[in-house]
C-alpha cells in the first residue's frame, strides 16, 4: 500500500512507511521555481507558503484558454512529491512557491535568475535553517544561468535540478550543466532510464545521480484530494530534493559537497541498464539510484569519494581535458581515458590555488577525458610529487617522501607521441606501497596526503591474457581514491574509478593478439580515515 | 559541467575602443563576449541579460545600464530596463534591439552579454 | 470484511468539548491508501464533512469547523478519535466515522467515503 | 465553499418507474461527484463515483452523468428497495453535501 518510488528510495530493511517520519526534513526550506500551485490541495496544505514572486512570459496562441487547474498542474504535483502528507518524501518539510513557469509549463532564463536573485535577497534578509532550491526546469546551455546557481551555491544553498526530458546530454541544457547543482536524472519501476515517447531521460557526465521518475503519484492540481502519475526528470529531481531534505534535517551543518558525496553514497549502484544511453556515453553517466540513507543520524566516520569526469578534448593534437573537484573536495588522485588509446596520460596542476586534473590527447586521438577522483578529507594536506622521464631502464617512480604523508594516488603523462610496444612492463617493486611506478619515458605524478588517521594501501590485479576490462575493489571500510593501470601495456585505453572499483580498459582484444604485454595489471588505492570513525564514535 | 561545451554558441565581437571615447572604457585587451542559446527555436531576440564584472557594485550597474539608455537614444533607439541585478549577479534586463549589441559590448565593467531564451518544465 | 463503530457520550453540555472515538475492525488503520474520517448529520439535514486523518497523524478539516475540530490516531489500538470544543445547540447531530480512499494507491479503489460506521446520535443539551 | 443543490426536494414516484434527480453545482467539480443512498436509521453508501463510475456490487439500474456544474443521477426501474434519500457530494475542493433528495413511494 505504498507508491512503488516511495518504496525504492528507502533502504531495503525498512519498512517504508514506518521509515519516512512524518517530521521528516521539518528543519529545511524548500524552495520551488516552477507553475503556480494549488496550496489548498491535501496533500500540501499549511506546508507550502506560496510566495509573491511572479515572473512568466506571456502563454503562447492565441486561443490559449487558461485553466486553473491546468496552469498549477506541474507544480502541485512536484511540492508532493517533495513534501506530500502521503505520497511526499520529506514529509515535514517546508515550502516555498516562485513562478517561473506559465500556464503552458514555459518560462525564461531571466525569470529564473530572477527567481534566484529573489530567494537570496530572501536569505539575507531572514536566514532560516538549510535552504534546498528545487529547479525542475531546463533551457539549452545558459552561462548566466549557471553563474547564478553558482552564486546561490556558494551562499550555502543547495540547488537540485532536472536533468532534462531530450534524451540528450544534460551537459548542452541549463542548469543541469551547472557543476555545482545537483542534477538529476529519471528511473523507472525497473531501474532503467525513463523512456518519455520519443525522447527521456538527459544522460551523460553532467547528471550526478538518478531518481524515481515514470508513473510517479503525486498530488493533482484537478481537485483537492486528487492524486495522478506523471513521469520526468523534475519528478526525479523532486525525489532528491525531498531526500537532501530529510539529510539535511538529520545533519543541518552539512555542506554541499558533503551532501552530495552522501547522497552518491547512499545511492544504489549498477542497477540501471546502461544499454539504453548512447555508447560514447555509458562510461560518462553515473549508475547511481538515489536513496535514503539507512539511518537518520549521520556517517561522519565515512570516507566520501566521487568521480568527475571531464568534458571531452576535442581531437587537436595538443588538446587537454580538465576535471575539477567542488571547492570543498580535494583531488585524491587523476586518471585519463580515450577510447581510440591514443592519450598522453595525465598530470595533477595547480590551477587558481586549487589542484586540478589535466589529461593530455596525443597525435592522431579522437581526444580524451580526465578524470579526477575527488574526496572529503577534512583538515587535508594535499600536495603533488613529480619524477620526471628516467633514463634508467627500470622506469620512472616516485613516492611520499613526507612524513605522515601516504600516497593516495597515481598519474603519468608522456611527451613522446606513443611509449612503443616493444618496452616490457614495469612492475612495482613489493613492500613499497608508497610509490609510484611508470615508464621510464613518462613523468610520474604521486598525489601524497596527510590527514589525521589517514592510511592507505595499494591492491592490484593482473590478467596475464588480455581483456577489454580488469578491475579491482577496495574492501568494505576501505574507499576507492587512486586508480591507475601498471605501466607497460601499450593497449589500455585509460583507467577510472566507478564507485569503489578501479577500472582499466584496453583495446579490443581481437585487435591486440596475446602477447606477454597483453598483460594487464589495474591498481587501485585504498583509503580509510581512522580519525573520522573515531569522531563517529565520540558522538555516538 | 565546464564551459566549453560546444553546442554552446559564443559570438565574440571586437571592441573599437575609439567609439564613444568612454570615459571608464574597458582594461586593454579584455572582450566582453555574446552569448546566445544555441537550440534556435528557444532563442528570445529582443531581451538581453547583460552581466558585469565580480565586483560591480548596484549604484555602477544603474549606471551603466542608464548609460547604455542614453547612447542607444543618440542612435534612435529605444530601450527599455526591466531588472537591475544584484545579490547574486551584477548586471541588469534590457529589451532592446539587437542593433545596440556591440555598443553593449563596449560598455564599461561588462564581462558578457546573454540573449534570453526560454526554459520549460521537466 | 472491515468494519467501524463509533462510541462516546450521547449527551453533552453547551460549551463543553464534544468527544467520540472509532474503533476500526477487520483491517488495520495502517495504510497509505485511507484516510479516517467523520461527518455528522444533524436531525432531518444534510451531511457535512468534518474532517480527516491519516495513521500518521495527518490532519485536514472543515475551513469552516477548523478552529473548534481536533482528530488524533491511535494506531496500536486501531482506533481514531473526534473532539468538537465549545459545542452549542447546533452541533446536536448523527456522528458517522468513515473510510475514506486516499487516492495515493490507485488499486485501494475511487477517492470516496465508504464503508461507514452506522453513526452515533450526539445531543448537546443542559 | 462550493454549493451543491440538489433537486427536486422529494420525488413521488411508483416502483418500475424512472426516477431523475439532479444536483447543481456553484462551481464547476468537473466529474469529481459522487451519489449517496441513505436509508432510514443507516449510513450511507456509496453508488456512483466520479460522475458516472457504478460502485461495487450497485446494480445496472442506477447510472450518474453530467460534468462540470450539473449531474444527473438515473434509477432507471424504481424497485421497492430503492425508496430512501439521496445525496450528492463533491471533491473538487474539499467535501461538500448536497441537501438530499427524498424519493417516496406515490
Known amino acids: 500500500s505504498i507508491p512503488w518510488n516511495l518504496e525504492r528510495i528507502t533502504p531495503p530493511r525498512y519498512r517504508a512507511d514506518e521509515y519516512q517520519p512524518p517530521d521528516g526534513g521539518s528543519l529545511v526550506e524548500v524552495y520551488l521555481l516552477d507553475t503556480s500551485i494549488q496550496s489548498d490541495h491535501r496533500e500540501i496544505e499549511g506546508r507550502v507558503m506560496v510566495t509573491d514572486f511572479e515572473n512568466v512570459p506571456e502563454e503562447d496562441g492565441t486561443r490559449f484558454h487558461r485553466q486553473a487547474s491546468k496552469c498549477d498542474s506541474h507544480g502541485t504535483h512536484l511540492a508532493g512529491v517533495v513534501s506530500g502528507r502521503d505520497a511526499g518524501v520529506a514529509k515535514g518539510a517546508s515550502m516555498r512557491s516562485l513562478r517561473v513557469l506559465n500556464c503552458q509549463g514555459k518560462g525564461t532564463v531571466s525569470g529564473t535568475l530572477i527567481g534566484l536573485e529573489f530567494i537570496r535577497k530572501s536569505q539575507l534578509v531572514q536566514p532560516v535553517g538549510p535552504l534546498v532550491v528545487l529547479l525542475p526546469l531546463a533551457g539549452g546551455y545558459s552561462r548566466v544561468l549557471n553563474a547564478a546557481c553558482q552564486r546561490l551555491a556558494r551562499a550555502g544553498v543547495v540547488l537540485v535540478t532536472a536533468a532534462g526530458n531530450f534524451r540528450d546530454d544534460a551537459c548542452l541544457y541549463s542548469p543541469a550543466s551547472a557543476p555545482e547543482v545537483i542534477t538529476v536524472g529519471a528511473t523507472n519501476a525497473q531501474d532503467q532510464p525513463v523512456t518519455l515517447g520519443t525522447l527521456g531521460t538527459n544522460f551523460g557526465r553532467c547528471v550526478d545521480l538518478f531518481a524515481p521518475g515514470e508513473d510517479i503519484i503525486g498530488a493533482s492540481s484537478d481537485c483537492s484530494t486528487c492524486f495522478v502519475s506523471q513521469s520526468g526528470t523534475s519528478q526525479a529531481a523532486a525525489h532528491v530534493a525531498g531526500i537532501a531534505a530529510m539529510m539535511l534535517s538529520a545533519e543541518p551543518e552539512l555542506t554541499l559537497a558533503e551532501l552530495r558525496q552522501r547522497l552518491i553514497h547512499f545511492s544504489a549502484k549498477d542497477v540501471i541498464n546502461e544499454a539504453w544511453f548512447p555508447e560514447d556515453q555509458r562510461v560518462l553517466t553515473p549508475n547511481l539510484v538515489a536513496a535514503l540513507p539507512p539511518s537518520t543520524h549521520g556517517a561522519g566516520w565515512q570516507l566520501f569519494c566521487r568521480t568527475v569526469w571531464s568534458a571531452h578534448s576535442g581531437p587537436t593534437r595538443m588538446a587537454t581535458a580538465v576535471a575539477r573537484c567542488a571547492p570543498d573536495e580535494e583531488l585524491l588522485s587523476c586518471s585519463s581515458f580515450s577510447r581510440s588509446g591514443k592519450r598522453r596520460g595525465e598530470r595533477m596542476e595547480a590551477q587558481g590555488g586549487k589542484l586540478v586534473c589535466r589529461a593530455h590527447n596525443a597525435f592522431g586521438g579522437e581526444g580524451v577525458y580526465a578524470i579526477a577522483r575527488c574526496c572529503l578529507l577534512p583538515q587535508a594536506n594535499c600536495s603533488v610529487h613529480t619524477a620526471p622521464p628516467a633514463e634508467a631502464s627500470m622506469g620512472t617512480r616516485v613516492h611520499c617522501h613526507q612524513q605522515g604523508h601516504v600516497l593516495t594516488g597515481c598519474s603519468s603523462h608522456w611527451e613522446v607521441e606513443d611509449l612503443g610496444t616493444h618496452k616490457p612492463p614495469v612492475l612495482r617493486p613489493r613492500g613499497q606501497p608508497n610509490q609510484c611506478v611508470g615508464h621510464r619515458e613518462a613523468s610520474i605524478h604521486a598525489s601524497c596526503c596527510h590527514a589525521p588517521g589517514l592510511e592507505c594501501k595499494v591492491k592490484e590485479h593482473g590478467i596475464p591474457a588480455p581483456q577489454e576490462q580488469v578491475t579491482v575493489a577496495c574492501e568494505e571500510g576501505w574507499t576507492l581514491t587512486g586508480c591507475s593501470a601498471l605501466p607497460g601495456t601499450s593497449h589500455v585505453l585509460g583507467a577510472y574509478a566507478v564507485d569503489n572499483t578501479c577500472v582499466v580498459r584496453s583495446r579490443d582484444v581481437s585487435t591486440t593478439g596475446s602477447t606477454s604485454e597483453g598483460a594487464v595489471t589495474a591498481v587501485a588505492i585504498c583509503c580509510r580515515s581512522r580519525h573520522l570513525a573515531q569522531a563517529s564514535q565520540e558522538l555516538q | 559541467q565546464e564551459d566549453e561545451d560546444g553546442d554552446y554558441e559564443e559570438l565574440v565581437l571586437a571592441l573599437r575602443s575609439e567609439e564613444d571615447g568612454l570615459a571608464e572604457a574597458p582594461e586593454h585587451g579584455t572582450t566582453a563576449t555574446f552569448h546566445r542559446c544555441a537550440k534556435d527555436p528557444w532563442r528570445l531576440p529582443g531581451t538581453y541579460v547583460v552581466v558585469l564584472k565580480e565586483e560591480t557594485h548596484l549604484s555602477q550597474s544603474e549606471r551603466t545600464a542608464r548609460r547604455l539608455q542614453a547612447q542607444a537614444a543618440r542612435r534612435g533607439y529605444l530601450t527599455k530596463i526591466l531588472h537591475v541585478f544584484h545579490g547574486l549577479l551584477p548586471g541588469f534586463l534590457v529589451k532592446m534591439s539587437g542593433d545596440l549589441l556591440e555598443l553593449a559590448l563596449k560598455l564599461p565593467h561588462v564581462d558578457y552579454i546573454e540573449e534570453d531564451s526560454s526554459v520549460f518544465a521537466q | 470484511q472491515l468494519q467501524l463503530q463509533e462510541s462516546g457520550p450521547g449527551l453533552v453540555k453547551p460549551s463543553e468539548t464534544l468527544s467520540l472515538t472509532c474503533t476500526v475492525s477487520?483491517?488495520?488503520?495502517?495504510?497509505?491508501?485511507?484516510?479516517w474520517g467523520w461527518i455528522r448529520q444533524p436531525p432531518g439535514k444534510g451531511l457535512e464533512w468534518i474532517g480527516s486523518i491519516n495513521y500518521r497523524g495527518s490532519t485536514y478539516y472543515n475551513p469552516s469547523l477548523k478552529s473548534r475540530v481536533t482528530i488524533s490516531v491511535d494506531t496500536s489500538k486501531n482506533q481514531f478519535s473526534l473532539k468538537l470544543s465549545s459545542v452549542t445547540a447546533a452541533d446536536t447531530a448523527v456522528y458517522y466515522c468513515?473510510?475514506?480512499?486516499?487516492?495515493?494507491?490507485?488499486?485501494?479503489?475511487?477517492?470516496?467515503?465508504?464503508?461507514w460506521g452506522q453513526g452515533t446520535l450526539v445531543t448537546v443539551s443542559s | 465553499e462550493i454549493v451543491l443543490t440538489q433537486s427536486p426536494a422529494t420525488l413521488s414516484l411508483s416502483p418500475g418507474e424512472r426516477a431523475t434527480l439532479s444536483c447543481r453545482a456553484s462551481q464547476s467539480v468537473s466529474s469529481y461527484l459522487a451519489w449517496y443512498q441513505q436509508k432510514p436509521g443507516q449510513a450511507p453508501r456509496l453508488l456512483i463515483y466520479d460522475a458516472s463510475n457504478r460502485a461495487t456490487g450497485i446494480p445496472a439500474r442506477f447510472s450518474g452523468s453530467g460534468s462540470g456544474t450539473d449531474f444527473t443521477l438515473t434509477i432507471s426501474s424504481l424497485e421497492p428497495e430503492d425508496f430512501a434519500v439521496y445525496y450528492c457530494?463533491?471533491?473538487?475542493?474539499?467535501?461538500?453535501f448536497g441537501g438530499g433528495t427524498k424519493v417516496e413511494i406515490k
Open positions: 457530494q463533491q471533491r473538487r475542493n474539499w467535501f461538500t
Open positions: 477487520g483491517g488495520s488503520i495502517r495504510s497509505s491508501a485511507y484516510y
Open positions: 468513515a473510510r475514506e480512499n486516499s487516492g495515493v494507491v490507485p488499486a485501494a479503489g475511487p477517492n470516496w467515503f465508504g464503508p
